[in-house]
């Protein structure tokens, strides 16, 4: 039994770090493998993660990590019974994938302006709370070509756009994702999408 693709890990910088790897053949990850992880810190204990299958030869492990701080470094040992298959390390702050934003809401009652709001996925005392920026994706259910991305580079989790920038009388969907430049994170997953019917008063034409 060998590791074909070494584990790569990302952290949500709050509770879960996810490590994925591939074996050289079909593997029952949960019965055959264990991923041990330990904070590099005096007297810290080793924790065991039981991996799950992720495709035929793929495995994924969700590591519980609380109180992550930027200096934290973990050793990782992948075991098959008594055999050490791989040894590595992981610094959560250098491999961050933020949590997805939540509670995306479209407010359509603000005089021909669409107000999109969502929730920051971190509590105020988490370092990422004040460092997230967002991308909002809006698309038409009727027209696949009507697909746009708005970059929200300020901290407030909201976006205002004129309803008239979208077509009237049709349904749109929106979703949002986050990233943090300070940690050079990857993008989060998209939030669940929300749907609304876009309608606004066309201005009278002047002749």
């Amino acid at each position: 039994m060998k590791v074909l693709q070494e584990p790569t890990c990302v952290s949500d910088y709050m509770s879960i770090s996810t490590c994925e790897w591939k074996m050289n053949g079909p593997t029952n990850c949960s019965t055959e493998l264990r991923l041990l992880y330990q904070l590099v810190f005096l007297l810290s204990e080793a924790h065991t993660c039981i991996p799950e299958n992720n495709g035929g030869a793929g495995c994924v492990c969700h590591l519980l990590m609380d109180d992550v701080v930027s200096a934290d470094n973990y050793t990782l040992d992948l075991w098959a019974g008594q055999q050490l298959l791989w040894k590595g390390s992981f610094k959560p702050s250098e491999h961050v994938k933020p949590r997805a934003p939540g509670n995306l809401t479209v407010h359509t009652n603000v005089s021909d302006t669409l107000l999109l709001t969502w929730s920051n996925p971190y509590p105020p005392d988490n370092y990422l709370y004040n460092h997230l920026t967002y991308a909002v994706n809006i698309w038409s259910e009727n027209d696949p070509a009507d697909f746009r991305i708005y970059n929200v580079t300020y901290l407030e989790p909201s976006l205002r756009i004129a309803a008239s920038t979208l077509k009237s009388g049709i349904s749109y969907r929106a979703r949002v994702r986050a990233w943090a430049q300070c940690y050079n994170t990857t993008w989060s997953e998209w939030s669940p999408s929300t749907k609304w019917h876009n309608s606004y008063r066309e201005p009278f034409e002047q002749h």
């Epitope: 509770s15 904070l39 519980l64 609380d66 939030s191």
Partner: antibody, heavy 119, light 107 residues
Framework: EVQLVETGGGLVQPKGSLKLSCAAS????????MNWVRQAPGKGLEWVAR??????????YYADSVKDRFTLSRDDSQSMLYLQMNNLKTEDTAMYYC???????????WGQGTTVTVS | DIQMTQTTSSLSASLGDRVTISCSAS??????LNWYQQKPDGTVKLLIY???SLHSGVPSRFSGSGSGTDYSLTISNLEPEDFATYYC?????????FGGGTKLEIK
């Protein structure tokens, strides 16, 4: 082996005070966040409070039902967790569990609990 | 606050059965869901964290699944020690909240 032993429960009158203690052993106490969770007689589990580790400035969080009445603290040198409960109400009657936290709310080891009766 | 609902408060099953316990959240919790077992003597254990990850030392007959607002815990091939009360808990947002519990009883 992780062990969490709660003490300090007992019978107290409404508006009275009580201090619960939790002695932790078998793990690196100072790098873990800790919680108290309670269970009223015949009811489900209710999260009460949480304290983070020194690396996160011992930040504390409380359920709205106990905010401004309960105070959570820890002594890393003694591997002890404390819950000071003031202005107790009859609805605080419950079994109180000391719980280790391994990931912002994933509570992996629980003590046996200590009973608080407000009557 | 996020409300967690376990619609079935009690469930009867026989040894060797496969049972599924359901839990729903009042909003999307992005898989930040745990399952706990409480024995009649009050002992509480973490079984599953982050929807489907088996906690160390928990038998593989326990499994978890779900996404969005709907989650479930499945116990296959019930053993005598599995008759207990099971709670789901979200750790997406503070305050962390538990479902009301599902008591698994012997038929």
């Amino acid at each position: 082996e992780v062990q969490l032993v709660e003490t300090g429960g007992g019978l107290v009158q409404p508006k009275g005070s009580l201090k619960l203690s939790c002695a932790a052993s078998g793990f690196t106490f100072n790098t873990n966040a800790m919680n108290w969770v309670r269970q009223a007689p015949g009811k489900g589990l209710e999260w009460v409070a949480r304290i983070r580790s020194k690396s996160n400035n011992y930040a504390t969080y409380y359920a709205d039902s106990v905010k401004d009445r309960f105070t959570l603290s820890r002594d890393d040198s003694q591997s002890m967790l404390y819950l000071q409960m003031n202005n107790l109400k009859t609805e605080d009657t419950a079994m109180y569990y000391c719980v280790r936290d391994r990931g912002w709310g994933a509570m992996d080891y629980w003590g046996q609990g200590t009973t608080v009766t407000v009557s | 606050d996020i409300q967690m609902t376990q619609t079935t408060s009690s469930l009867s099953a026989s040894l060797g059965d496969r049972v599924t316990i359901s839990c729903s959240a009042s909003q999307d919790i992005n898989n930040y869901l745990n399952w706990y077992q409480q024995k009649p003597d009050g002992t509480v254990k973490l079984l599953i964290y982050y929807t489907s990850s088996l906690h160390s030392g928990v038998p593989s007959r326990f499994s978890g699944s779900g996404s969005g607002t709907d989650y479930s815990l499945t116990i296959s091939n019930l053993e005598p020690e599995d008759f207990a009360t099971y709670y789901c808990q979200q750790f997406s947002n503070l305050p962390w909240t538990f479902g009301g519990g599902t008591k698994l009883e012997i038929k």
